[in-house]
C-alpha cells in the first residue's frame, strides 16, 4: 500500500478506511465497523470482515461425507464481537440478550441461551470442507489440472500455505476442497483456513473483498470454472454441543 495519500489503500480488504497516519507516516488501515487496525499484507480475520459487513449499508450426498459433527452456517449474518486480535469471542449475544457459543470461524456450535450461558474457550475449526457444484461444461475437468489450479489459487490469492490444502476431490459436477489446520500446525503469520475459506466464499459469490482487483476468474486450462452452488462444512477440534431436539429435527 502506498503512502501518497490518494493511494493509501488496503489491497487485501476494501472494507477499510486508510490514511498515512500510522507510525512515521505509514499507511494505516482500519476495518469498518470495529475501527481496528488491520495488516494489509495478509487476509483480514473473518470476524472483522463480518463486523464491517454489518456496518455497511444493506445492499445432497457428497463425495466426502461430512462427519455427524460437521457444522453448516445456517444462522447467516450477525454482528459479531471480536477480541483485540480480531478473532471471534467464544460467546456471541444479540441485542435481545440471546447468547450462543461459536467456533473460530464464528459458526454457532451450541444451542442458544441467555446471558448466563458460558463459553469457556474458543474452539478451533481444524477441518473445513468446501463443497462446490460447477455449471455444466463440454466435458469434465481434468482432475490433476483442477487440483493444481485450486491449490495455486489458495496459495497465491489467499496466501494459504500449501500444506493446509489437504485434498481436492472431483466427481463431476462436484468439487470438494479440504482445508486442515490444527492449532499446533498454525505458526505465527500463517493465514487461518477459516479466513481463506471466507475470502474464497465471497469470491465465488462475486463479492470479492480485495481492493481494486477484478473478481475471481477461475480457469482450468483456459476453460472457465463457474460455480453454481457452494456448501461449506466446518469441523471443530471439540465436537459441538447441541441438544437432541436439534439433532432429530
Amino acid at each position: 500500500h502506498t503512502a501518497a495519500q490518494d493511494n493509501c489503500t488496503c489491497p487485501t480488504n476494501k472494507m477499510t478506511v486508510c490514511s498515512p497516519d500510522g507510525p512515521g507516516g505509514r499507511c494505516q488501515c482500519r476495518a469498518l465497523g470495529s475501527g481496528m487496525a488491520v495488516d494489509c499484507s495478509t487476509l483480514t480475520s473473518k470476524c472483522l470482515l463480518l463486523k464491517a459487513r454489518m456496518s455497511a449499508p444493506k445492499n445432497a450426498r457428497t463425495l466426502v461425507r461430512p462427519s455427524e459433527h460437521a457444522l453448516v452456517d445456517n444462522d447467516g449474518l450477525y454482528d459479531p464481537d471480536c477480541d483485540p486480535e480480531g478473532r471471534f469471542k467464544a460467546r456471541q449475544c444479540n441485542q435481545t440478550s440471546v447468547c450462543w457459543c461459536v467456533n473460530s470461524v464464528g459458526v454457532r456450535r451450541t444451542d442458544k441461551g441467555d446471558l448466563s450461558l458460558r463459553c469457556d474457550e474458543l474452539v478451533r475449526t481444524h477441518h473445513i470442507l468446501i463443497d462446490l457444484r460447477h455449471r455444466p461444461t463440454a466435458g469434465a475437468f481434468n482432475h490433476s489440472d483442477l487440483d493444481a489450479e485450486l491449490r495455486r489459487l489458495f496459495r497465491e490469492r489467499y496466501r494459504l500455505h500449501p500444506k493446509f490444502v489437504a485434498a481436492v476431490h472431483y466427481e463431476q459436477p462436484t468439487i470438494q476442497i479440504e482445508l486442515r489446520q490444527n492449532t499446533s500446525q498454525k505458526a505465527a503469520g500463517d493465514v487461518d483456513i477459516g479466513d481463506a475459506a471466507y475470502y474464497f466464499e465471497r469470491d465465488i459469490k462475486g463479492e470479492s473483498l480485495f481492493q481494486g482487483r477484478g473478481g475471481l476468474d477461475l480457469r482450468v486450462r483456459g476453460e472457465p470454472l463457474q460455480v453454481e452452488r457452494t456448501l461449506i462444512y466446518y469441523l471443530d477440534e471439540i465436537p459441538p454441543k447441541f441438544s437432541m431436539k436439534r439433532l432429530t429435527a
Epitope: 501518497a4 507510525p23 505509514r26
Partner: antibody, heavy 120, light 107 residues
Framework: QVQLVQSGAEVKKPGASVKVSCKAS????????INWVRQATGRGLEWMGW????????GYAQKFQGRVTITADESTSTAYMELSSLRSEDTAVYYC?????????????WGQGTMVTVSS | DIQLTQSPSSVSASVGDRVTITCRAS??????LAWYRQKPGKAPKLLIY???SLQSGVPSRFSGSGSGTDFTLTISSLQPEDFATYYC?????????FGQGTRLEIK
C-alpha cells in the same frame, strides 16, 4: 528532484525556543507526512514527532510532549518544528524526513540537518 | 515503547568481507522494520524497508531478513563506502524508535 531543505544553524540560550523549517520540493507536499528526528553529537537517532500536512494530524514522542510543536504551511510546502524550554541536552542536529512512497513508515528523503546549539 | 537492540555495537571488517548486523525488538513488530546507513556529518540513507525490501538505487549487496522480533542486515561484500554507522528503525507502533546503532570500522 525530490528534496527537503532545512534552515540554517541556530544558537540559543537555555529556556528559549527554536523553530526549524523544512522546505519540500519535487513532490506534492500534502501527499506525504513529515517526521522530525534528532541526533546529539556522537549519539543515536531519536524520533521526535510527525505531521500529516493534509489532515493536520500530529503525533509526538512522549519525551517531547508539551515542548514540541510541528506545523506546516501548504502554500510554501514548508514544515516547521518548534522546540521550547530549551536545555543543554537539546543540543543536536535536527532532521526532517519524509516517509517512503511504499507507505511502510521508513524514511527515504531526509533534510541536510540543522545544528541547534543550546548554551548560556 | 518498543526497544530495538542492535548487535554488535561495533564491528571491524575488511573490504570484501561479509557482515551481518542484528536488530532485536522488545515486542513483535511484524515486518515494519527499516535499515539505514549513516556517514559522519551526513543524514541517514534508507537501505531496506519492510524488513527485506531493497530501497531503489541501493546496491544488491545489501539484504534484510526477519519478522516479528528478530531481524538481520547483511552486506555480502563490503565496499569502502560501507564503513559507517547502521541503524534499524521500527514503524509498527508509536512512537517510532531506532536501534542504538552499529559502527562498522575498517580492520
Amino acid at each position: 528532484q525530490v528534496q527537503l531543505v532545512q534552515s540554517g544553524a541556530e544558537v540559543k540560550k537555555p529556556g528559549a525556543s527554536v523553530k526549524v523549517s523544512c522546505k519540500a520540493s519535487g513532490y506534492t507536499f500534502t501527499n506525504y507526512g513529515i517526521n522530525w528526528v534528532r541526533q546529539a553529537t556522537g549519539r543515536g537517532l531519536e524520533w521526535m514527532g510527525w505531521m500529516n500536512p493534509r489532515s493536520g494530524n500530529t503525533g509526538y514522542a512522549q519525551k517531547f510532549q508539551g515542548r514540541v510543536t510541528i506545523t506546516a504551511d501548504e502554500s510554501t510546502s514548508t514544515a516547521y518544528m518548534e522546540l521550547s524550554s530549551l536545555r543543554s541536552e537539546d543540543t543536536a542536529v535536527y532532521y526532517c524526513a519524509r516517509p517512503n512512497t511504499g507507505g511502510d513508515g521508513a524514511f527515504d528523503i531526509w533534510g541536510q540537518g540543522t545544528m541547534v546549539t543550546v548554551s548560556s | 515503547d518498543i526497544q530495538l537492540t542492535q548487535s554488535p555495537s561495533s564491528v571491524s571488517a575488511s573490504v570484501g568481507d561479509r557482515v551481518t548486523i542484528t536488530c532485536r525488538a522488545s515486542q513483535g513488530i511484524k515486518s515494519w522494520l527499516a535499515w539505514y546507513r549513516q556517514k559522519p556529518g551526513k543524514a541517514p540513507k534508507l537501505l531496506i524497508y519492510r524488513a527485506r525490501s531493497l530501497q531503489s538505487g541501493v546496491p544488491s549487496r545489501f539484504s534484510g531478513s526477519g519478522s516479528g522480533t528478530d531481524f538481520t542486515l547483511t552486506i555480502s561484500s563490503l565496499q569502502p563506502e560501507d564503513f559507517a554507522t547502521y541503524y534499524c528503525q521500527q514503524a509498527n507502533s508509536f512512537p517510532v524508535t531506532f536501534g542504538q546503532g552499529t559502527r562498522l570500522e575498517i580492520k
